[in-house]
Interface confidence: low
């Protein structure tokens, strides 16, 4: 999906008002574990591409993020503020339902959510050149 035509300010507002808190809640209890930010992005559409990938694509060691509160709110924000986004996700959602697993918070998931925090921060940062 091409995120170029999203309403970035509305997504920024959604992130600030709810998604950021849900990410913090998910990470709470990690004893100041420091994960290095290895995933980055260079502009707002690129950031959303990386955010979508990390949030909704299962990875080795972490298959359970899509049902987390921050993920559901991310999906809602993208569906509302990115024209045509929801249509592209119908097939992906159906596939995800088939492989839905028990919710388990693994260290790998915590690392992935830490990367997500970094990506959202870069999306939200005022220094970012808007493409």
């Amino acid at each position: 999906y091409d995120f170029t035509n999203c309403d970035f300010e509305k997504i920024k507002a959604a992130y600030l008002s709810t998604i950021s808190k849900d990410l913090i809640t998910y990470m709470s209890g990690t004893k100041s574990t420091e994960f290095n930010n290895t995933v980055s992005c260079s502009n707002r559409p690129h950031c959303l591409t990386e955010i979508q990938s990390l949030t909704f694509n299962p990875t080795a060691g972490c298959a359970s993020l899509a049902k987390e509160m921050f993920a559901m709110k991310t999906k809602a924000a993208l569906a509302i503020w990115c024209p045509g986004y929801s249509e592209t996700q119908i097939n992906a959602t159906q596939a995800m339902k088939k492989r839905r697993k028990r919710k388990v918070t693994t260290n790998k998931c915590l690392e992935q959510v830490s990367q997500l925090q970094g990506l959202w921060r870069r999306f939200n940062r005022p220094l970012l050149k808007q493409q």
């Epitope: 600030l16 008002s17 290095n36 830490s114 940062r125």
Partner: antibody, heavy 117, light 107 residues
Framework: QVQLQQSGPQLVRPGASVKISCKAS????????MHWVKQRPGQGLEWIGL????????GLNQNFKDKATLTVDISSRTAYMQISSPTSEDSAVYFC??????????WGQGTTLTVSS | DIQMTQSPASLSASVGETVTITCRAS??????LAWYQQKQGKSPQLLVY???TLAEGVPSRFSGSGSGTQFSLKINSLQPEDFGSYYC?????????FGGGTKLELK
């Protein structure tokens, strides 16, 4: 716990550049922006600029573009602000503060800079 | 640049009173506003962010409200430790700017 420890008070001559430090501990240094804020005696707060420790990219208030230089040293988890050609107008307390979303949840204790001949 | 106009500049009140400080932005900043308290010789402390969310550890007698261009900070039943200076700050776009401050003094 999160701490931002700033360098001590400095007395400098006009024109002699000065560097203030802010050492972070208790959190992931590269996840948060580091900001610098100026407060002149008896005055309000003025945003100087910010730096992203993850890549060293900085953004400055236009009022400070020829005055302040922001840098970080990830290995020592320290942010720096250099003030060039200081004058009496630069005499102030300078704070570092961390931010994830634009508001400052932790502040350094402040560094008093006095510019006097 | 977005200008933040805070009022009143100073305010005298007694312990137990309720006070309200207001902040006006020169353009729409949605809910991108924070409030800080600063005691003499100390660093500012975050009270409220996102216009109305109370920061961790802040007593419930503090409350923030507003969105768009008009915001306010209300302190119910003032306590002796509440006296000091208060600042609003927007973080919608750079440069982030602060209000001029409100000095809350004991009557």
């Amino acid at each position: 716990q999160v701490q931002l420890q700033q360098s001590g008070p400095q007395l400098v001559r006009p024109g002699a550049s000065v560097k203030i430090s802010c050492k972070a501990s208790g959190y992931s240094f590269t996840t948060y922006w580091m900001h610098w804020v100026k407060q002149r005696p008896g005055q309000g707060l003025e945003w100087i600029g910010l730096i992203d420790p993850s890549d060293g990219e900085a953004g400055l208030n236009q009022n400070f573009k020829d005055k302040a230089t922001l840098t970080v040293d990830i290995s020592s988890r320290t942010a720096y602000m250099q003030i060039s050609s200081p004058t009496s107008e630069d005499s102030a307390v300078y704070f570092c503060a961390r931010s994830l979303d634009g508001y400052y949840d932790y502040w350094g204790q402040g560094t008093t800079l006095t510019v006097s001949s | 640049d977005i200008q933040m106009t805070q009022s009143p500049a100073s305010l005298s009140a007694s312990v137990g009173e309720t006070v309200t400080i207001t902040c006006r932005a020169s353009e729409d900043i949605y809910s991108y506003l924070a409030w800080y308290q600063q005691k003499q010789g100390k660093s500012p402390q975050l009270l409220v962010y996102n216009a109305k969310t109370l920061a961790e550890g802040v007593p419930s007698r503090f409350s923030g409200s507003g969105s768009g261009t008009q915001f306010s900070l209300k302190i119910n039943s003032l306590q002796p430790e509440d006296f000091g200076s208060y600042y609003c700050q927007h973080f919608w776009s750079t440069p982030w700017t602060f209000g001029g401050g409100t000095k809350l003094e004991l009557k």
